[in-house]
């Protein structure tokens, strides 16, 4: 907290410029008008203020906007955003995707901080759902974003937004998350033809039920082993040897290398040895 002191004669700031870097903390407090700061926030980032000086500028904005900053100020916070606490951010009402992008840019290259997580949460809740443009933006900055959401949060993702999801965005999703996302993807891609559909749905198959896997096995999709290994164990177990052979196509030989791993291990144990022998891979049930 900076003490209230009178501004020395001739030091009253008329605009936000580089001369302010020579001001002591108490001088910034006394000589910079908060309303001026708010209207010229876009200049702050071009000036090499110290962390201590930024603290003073934040304090001035906090005093001017005790109920939370307006979006016109938020959009131009720049590096001052790093000074904000989650509690500060919870007071904001961010509606513009451009504002969101501007603040995410400040944190670019770093892991998602509590501040960023709170900002995103406020933004998405304000919009009511995770639309395609928002998802595009968030996954561009944080490829793991989608998988950081709870199944409950994912349920608000409309199927149309699924088009924005890239395979790498799903790398860290767990089964419960894929259970929510798979039906949305199935709906989003339903009008595509066989081979194109499989390319799009492949990353989501960790949430697919047995009947969908059986259907895919009839379409010559040649699923790779990496995808097969991510399928739900309970979805794989009812598949027959013939169905797995059709599903994997030429990749069926890869089962041998994965015979000690789930879900392959569980599936092998549930097959008749005679059926396994037809694969010619030496798999033992």
């Amino acid at each position: 907290e900076v003490e209230k002191t009178a501004c020395p004669s001739g030091k009253k700031a008329r605009e936000i410029d580089e001369s302010l870097i020579f001001y002591k903390k108490w001088e910034l407090e006394a000589c910079v008008d908060a309303a001026l700061l708010a209207t010229q926030m876009d200049r702050v980032n071009a000036i090499p203020f110290t962390y201590e000086q930024l603290d003073v500028l934040k304090h001035k904005l906090d005093e001017l906007y005790p109920q939370g900053y307006p979006e016109s100020v938020i959009q131009h916070l720049g590096y001052l955003f790093l000074k904000m606490s989650p509690e500060d951010i919870r007071k904001w009402n961010v509606t513009s995707l451009e504002t969101l992008k501007a603040l995410l840019e400040v944190n670019k290259g770093h892991e998602m901080s509590p501040q960023v997580a709170t900002l995103i949460d406020r933004f998405v809740k304000g919009r009511g759902q995770l639309d395609k443009d928002t998802l595009d933006t968030l996954t561009a900055f944080y490829p793991g974003y989608l998988c950081s959401l709870s199944p409950e949060e994912l349920s608000s993702v409309p199927p149309s937004s699924i088009w924005a999801v890239r395979p790498q965005d799903l790398d860290t999703c767990d089964p419960r998350q894929l259970d929510v996302l798979y039906p949305k993807a199935r709906l989003a891609f339903q009008n595509m033809n066989g081979s194109e559909y499989f390319v799009k749905i492949q990353s989501f198959l960790g949430g697919a039920p047995t009947e969908d896997l059986k259907a895919l096995s009839q379409q010559n999709v040649s699923m790779d082993l990496a995808t097969f290994m991510k399928l739900r164990t309970d979805a794989v177990l009812p598949l027959t040897v013939a169905e797995v052979q059709k599903l994997l196509g030429p990749h069926v030989e890869g089962l041998k290398a994965e015979e000690r791993h789930r879900p392959v291990r569980d599936w092998i144990l549930r097959q008749r040895q005679d059926d396994l022998d037809t694969l010619g891979l030496g798999l033992q049930g």
């Epitope: 998350q177 000690r260 789930r262 291990r265």
Partner: antibody
Framework: QVQLQESGPGLVKPSETLSLTCTVS??????????WSWIRQPPGKGLEWIGY???????NYNPSLKSRVTISVDTSKNQFSLKLSSVTAADTAVYYC???????????WGQGTMVTVSS | DIQMTQSPSSLSASVGDRVTITCRAS??????LNWYQQKPGKAPKLLIY???SLQSGVPSRFSGSGSGTDFTLTISSLQPEDFATYYC?????????FGGGTKVEIK
């Protein structure tokens, strides 16, 4: 509900064979949905998986114990058993039997039985 | 064998604290990761299976997350009955392995 109960001698001499039985009540070892495992815990230490058996008789053992372990199932008695040969003091532990469900986790455990290897 | 490394090995916390325990696998185990709680003289109790699914009857203050090699068990608000030792376990590879355990003690 399903319950597991370990039984067997609490004291075994070095170089002899440790034999334990797990009796399943309220469920069947013949169910194709489960694996039946043995797990042990030396005093003051962590958990070590020993091996499992499937109702069909298929077994899978911890590689570090494989040469000394045999797990068998008796569906008529609704039991599965553990035999560990050539025991030493290092085999002194609480031995648990456990059921592994479809989710790949040990969802039901016996209360454990302490086995001491000493002459 | 797949090695499971838990951290920390022990921690002191107070009732109401948020507690996080991590488990790292030496290679990818997909989501085949389970968490158990064990109290002295008792058998372990399953808390979380398949990385994030809460076992029936387990309080919702327990949650799990992660996939691949890095996993987390979180207790959102520690209760007196939660002071115990926690173990992670992988069931992806046929040779199951447990983490070394994390003892949660009263501060």
């Amino acid at each position: 509900q399903v319950q597991l109960q370990e039984s067997g001698p609490g004291l075994v001499k070095p170089s002899e064979t440790l034999s334990l039985t797990c009796t399943v009540s309220g469920g069947s070892v013949s169910s194709g949905s489960y694996y039946w495992s043995w797990i042990r815990q030396p005093p003051g230490k962590g958990l070590e998986w020993i091996g499992y058996i499937y109702y069909s008789g298929s077994t899978n053992y911890n590689p570090s114990l494989k040469s000394r372990v045999t797990i068998s199932v008796d569906t008529s008695k609704n039991q599965f058993s553990l035999k560990l040969s050539s025991v030493t003091a290092a085999d002194t532990a609480v031995y648990y039997c456990a059921r592994e469900g479809k989710n790949g986790a040990f969802d039901i455990w016996g209360q454990g039985t302490m086995v001491t290897v000493s002459s | 064998d797949i090695q499971m490394t838990q951290s920390p090995s022990s921690l002191s916390a107070s009732v109401g604290d948020r507690v996080t325990i991590t488990c790292r696998a030496s290679q990818s185990i997909s989501s085949y990761l389970n968490w158990y709680q064990q109290k002295p003289g008792k058998a372990p109790k399953l808390l979380i299976y398949a990385a994030s699914s809460l076992q029936s009857g387990v309080p919702s203050r327990f949650s799990g997350s992660g996939s691949g090699t890095d996993f987390t068990l979180t207790i959102s608000s520690l209760q007196p009955e939660d002071f115990a030792t926690y173990y992670c376990q992988q069931s992806y590879d046929a040779s199951y392995t447990f983490g070394g355990g994390t003892k949660v003690e009263i501060k």
